[in-house]
Structure formats: structure tokens, C-alpha cells
């Protein structure tokens, strides 16, 4: 029972985590304009992995995709790659874990096979979570470096040479979503690995005796049901988990509601 709960919970936690990783990857707010100690502007800039956006105080929002591939910083490409690898591994892990769930019966799948699948999906979730955490952390490090560089530029005597106002960027909401989602996926993966240990059939010192009936064959094991992991009456009330996670991609059009003036 505890094994089933651990496996089921691991699956749900990972599902939420992967949904979060997908959401973070799609979000535009990876970096947002730093408003602290800056002149108050009527324009707010924010950037994602795929496009940069400008929201005017009028409510008008304009987003431009990064249509170049070669012109983008290597770090940004690396973050994109890490997030996509995390999503792909997580998606495969989810697919594998659905078949591995103890509360779902597929044909005459052996317990050992379910245990192996649970372990595989657990490892995939762990790697997926680590990829997301790494991706978000690399981006955050990039922001911190650029922040202090632009701060230094603001206070060095550039005079009238600079034609644009130095826009500093700080952590956006997507970073926190990514960190939490990566952590959840990692925790879910660990839970799946723990559940795998309980799923693996126990080795016994005695040989099973088979009694063959004429119509169909049933294998009986002496010593009660300690080693049993079959779908008997005790599985009637097991919850079958279905992933209802949705990601919302912000679609802003003009005119829109404005959240600041």
C-alpha cells in the first residue's frame, strides 16, 4: 500500500513538475527590467528564451521573437537546450511511469518489469529536474553577471556617448517557476526510485509448487500473501492518476488590461 502511494505520489509530483518546466520554458518573464533605483519609465521590458517583450504603460504590449539562431548568445542556446532536454526526458519518463504504475494493469506485466520501469522513469525525472534547475541557474548567473556589468557602466563616465538608457535586468517569474518545477520533478523522481525498491519481488528460499488444473493454470506460493503484488480485491479503491495539468501561455493583445500605470 505504501509503495503504491509513494509511486502514485511520485508520479503526480513529477507531472506537476514537468508541467511547470514546460510553463517556465514558454514564459516570457525570464528576465525583467530592474525598477529599483532606476528612473521611473513608462515602458517595461522583459525577456524570455524565445522572445523579448515591451509593455507600455498604455497597456500596449509588443513581443518580438529571436528569429536568428547564430546571433544568439551561446549561454542562451545552452539554457534552451537544457530546458528542452528536461522536457523531453520528463515526457518520456511520464509515459514510462504510466505503464509502471502499480494501480494500472497492463496485460500480464511482471512485477520486476514494473519495478524496472519505475526505476527508469525515476532516473529520467531526476535528470529532467536537474536539467531544468541547471538551465534556470545558468540563466540566473548570466543575469547577475550582466546586472553588475551594467551597474558598473552606469556609474563610469560614459557621458553623452551612450545613446540608449542602460536597462538592467533582474530575475523574472519564470526563473522561480523553473526552480520550483525542477525541484518537484527531482523529488518525484526520487520518490519513484524509492517506490521501485518496494516493487521488486522478494527473493524466497523455497521453490514454488505448481498445481495444474485442466482449464487454466494458477500458481500458488506457500507462506501467505507476503510476496504478493497481484491485483486482488485490495486494489479496487486505488486511484488511477490522470494528469490534468495545463500550462497557460500569456497572450497579450492591444488594448489590454494594464497591471501598472
Amino acid at each position: 500500500m505504501a509503495v503504491t502511494a509513494c509511486q502514485g505520489l511520485g508520479f503526480v509530483v513529477s507531472l506537476i513538475g514537468i508541467a511547470g518546466i514546460i510553463a517556465a520554458t514558454c514564459m516570457d518573464q525570464w528576465s525583467t527590467q530592474d525598477l529599483y533605483n532606476n528612473p521611473v519609465t513608462a515602458v517595461f521590458n522583459y525577456q524570455g528564451l524565445w522572445r523579448s517583450c515591451v509593455r507600455e504603460s498604455s497597456g500596449f504590449t509588443e513581443c518580438r521573437g529571436y528569429f536568428t539562431l547564430l546571433g544568439l548568445p551561446a549561454m542562451l542556446q545552452a539554457v534552451r537546450a537544457l530546458m528542452i532536454v528536461g522536457i523531453v526526458l520528463g515526457a518520456i519518463g511520464l509515459l514510462v511511469s504510466i505503464f509502471a504504475l502499480k494501480c494500472i494493469r497492463i496485460g500480464s506485466m511482471e512485477d520486476s518489469a514494473k519495478a524496472n520501469m519505475t526505476l527508469t522513469s525515476g532516473i529520467m525525472f531526476i535528470v529532467s529536474g536537474l536539467c531544468a534547475i541547471a538551465g534556470v541557474s545558468v540563466f540566473a548567473n548570466m543575469l547577475v553577471t550582466n546586472f553588475w556589468m551594467s551597474t558598473a557602466n552606469m556609474y563610469t563616465g560614459m557621458g553623452g556617448m551612450v545613446q540608449t538608457v542602460q536597462t538592467r535586468y533582474t530575475f523574472g517569474a519564470a526563473l522561480f517557476v523553473g526552480w520550483v518545477a525542477g525541484g518537484l520533478t527531482l523529488i518525484g523522481g526520487v520518490m519513484m526510485c524509492i517506490a521501485c525498491r518496494g516493487l521488486a519481488p522478494e527473493e524466497t528460499n523455497y521453490k514454488a509448487v505448481s498445481y495444474h488444473a485442466s482449464g487454466h493454470s494458477v500458481a500458488y506460493k506457500p507462506g501467505g500473501f507476503k510476496a504478493s503484488t497481484g491485483f486482488g480485491s485490495n486494489t479496487k479503491n486505488k486511484k488511477i492518476y490522470d494528469g490534468g495539468a495545463r500550462t497557460e501561455d500569456e497572450v497579450q493583445s492591444y488594448p489590454s488590461k494594464h497591471d501598472y500605470v
Epitope: 513608462a42 515591451v54 500596449f60
Partner: antibody, heavy 118, light 113 residues
């Protein structure tokens, strides 16, 4: 078409307050900011502040901070500008305007002349 | 506050001739996020509210004749009336739409010579 209709001219005594209304029509009231701009006789334009009628958020020109209050009533779809502690130099035409893309003002009210005189 | 300086204060141009108004900002109005300059031009005729002509420094508002054009970037901007018409006699204002408080230039009065 978009229209912003303002209240009539006012004559006020120094130290008193004035409340000017602005009723837009022809668009969704809560979707655009309403800004207030004043123009003293024979002078240039001076931005006073803006309000988001949807959320009630306001931004003011520090020059008027504490003296000007911008409000919006969603039920009557009307924006208001109240200026207190009036002085003779507050004699001006007060305009309301709709803020659009580029943070520019595309539609303006006809203006309300406020005269401060003892 | 951002100071918007317009020049000249007044301008007399013959009908059909080119009129050029300059506007200088004390700080750059170019937003790095979208590479747009947050500067607007208005036309105001006596007894009327201002009328929007150009936003984002060079984007003409719908319904504005194409003889009006805006140019410039960063701190220096220009409004050009390619062929002055009688109905263009007015005061022209530039506005900073990037920094709060949103500030206007002192205005340039355009007259017919």
C-alpha cells in the same frame, strides 16, 4: 468614434478645490489610461498625471503630488481630476486625454477652463 | 525631470515650402527593448485641444497627411512638414513618453510668411 466630454468652466477662490470630470465614449473605458494635461493661458502643455480606470492605479507628476487626486468611477464610466489648495497660477485649461500605443495621447477632451481669482 | 527643448520658438514659412522643427531631450528616449524612441509630436490650433501627429518618433497617426514626417533617435528629433499648407498654421509640441513625468517641449509656432 472616440470622444471625451469634460465638465464646464469653473471659477474658484484661492485655497479652494476644483473637481473636473471627463466622460469618455466610443471605447471600453477600463482598457485605456486617462491622463490629465493642463495649459496656462498662452503657455505650453504640462502633464499632471494618469489613472488606470480598470485598476484605479495612478501616477502623478511630483510637482502636483499631494494637491491632485485622480479617480475613476467604473459604474458611470467617468474619470475625475481634483486639484486642491488652488492658487492664481493654477488658472489654466485642463484637458483629459486617452493614452494609447507609444504612450501618446490620441483623443483629447475639449478642455475645462478653471479660473482662480479672489 | 526630462527637459524637452524645442527650436525655433517660431517659424515663418512660405506656402508649399518645407518647415523643420527640432526637439532635443535631456536624456535618450530610445528604449533598448524594442529599439523605439518614445517621442510624440502634437499639433495645436487656437482654441482646440492638441492633435496627435506622430508617435514612436516616426510613426504617423492614421488620418495624418503624409506631408508630416518625424525622424531622429536618442536625444535629437525632427518634425518636418514637406509642403506647408494654410491649415498647418499651429503650435507644434514634442513630448517625452518614456520617463515620468511625461514632459512637453515649449512649443514651436508655425506661421505663413
Amino acid at each position: 468614434q472616440v470622444q471625451l466630454v469634460q465638465s464646464g468652466a469653473e471659477v474658484k477662490k484661492p485655497g479652494s478645490s476644483v473637481k473636473v470630470s471627463c466622460k469618455p465614449s466610443g471605447y471600453a473605458f477600463t482598457n485605456y489610461l486617462i491622463d490629465w494635461v493642463r495649459q496656462a493661458p498662452g503657455q505650453g502643455l504640462e502633464w499632471m498625471g494618469g489613472i488606470n480606470p480598470g485598476s484605479g492605479d495612478t501616477v502623478y507628476n511630483e510637482k502636483f503630488q499631494g494637491r491632485v487626486t485622480l479617480t475613476a468611477d467604473k459604474s458611470s464610466m467617468t474619470a475625475y481630476m481634483e486639484l486642491s489648495s488652488l492658487r492664481s497660477e493654477d488658472t489654466a485649461v485642463y484637458f483629459c486625454a486617452r493614452r494609447v500605443r507609444g504612450n501618446s495621447f490620441d483623443s483629447w477632451g475639449q478642455g475645462t477652463l478653471v479660473t482662480v481669482s479672489s | 525631470d526630462i527637459v524637452m527643448t524645442q527650436s525655433p520658438d517660431s517659424l515663418a514659412v512660405s506656402l508649399g515650402e518645407r518647415a523643420t522643427i527640432n526637439c532635443k531631450s535631456s536624456q535618450s528616449l530610445l528604449n533598448s527593448g524594442n529599439q523605439k524612441n518614445y517621442l510624440t509630436w502634437y499639433q495645436q490650433k487656437p482654441g482646440q485641444p492638441p492633435k496627435l501627429l506622430i508617435y514612436w518618433a516616426s510613426t504617423r497617426e492614421s488620418g495624418v497627411p503624409d506631408r508630416f514626417s518625424g525622424s531622429g533617435s536618442g536625444k535629437d528629433f525632427t518634425l518636418t512638414i514637406s509642403s506647408l499648407q494654410a491649415e498647418d498654421v499651429a503650435v507644434y509640441y514634442c513630448q517625452n513618453n518614456y520617463f515620468y513625468p511625461l514632459t512637453f517641449g515649449g512649443g514651436t509656432k508655425v506661421e505663413i510668411k
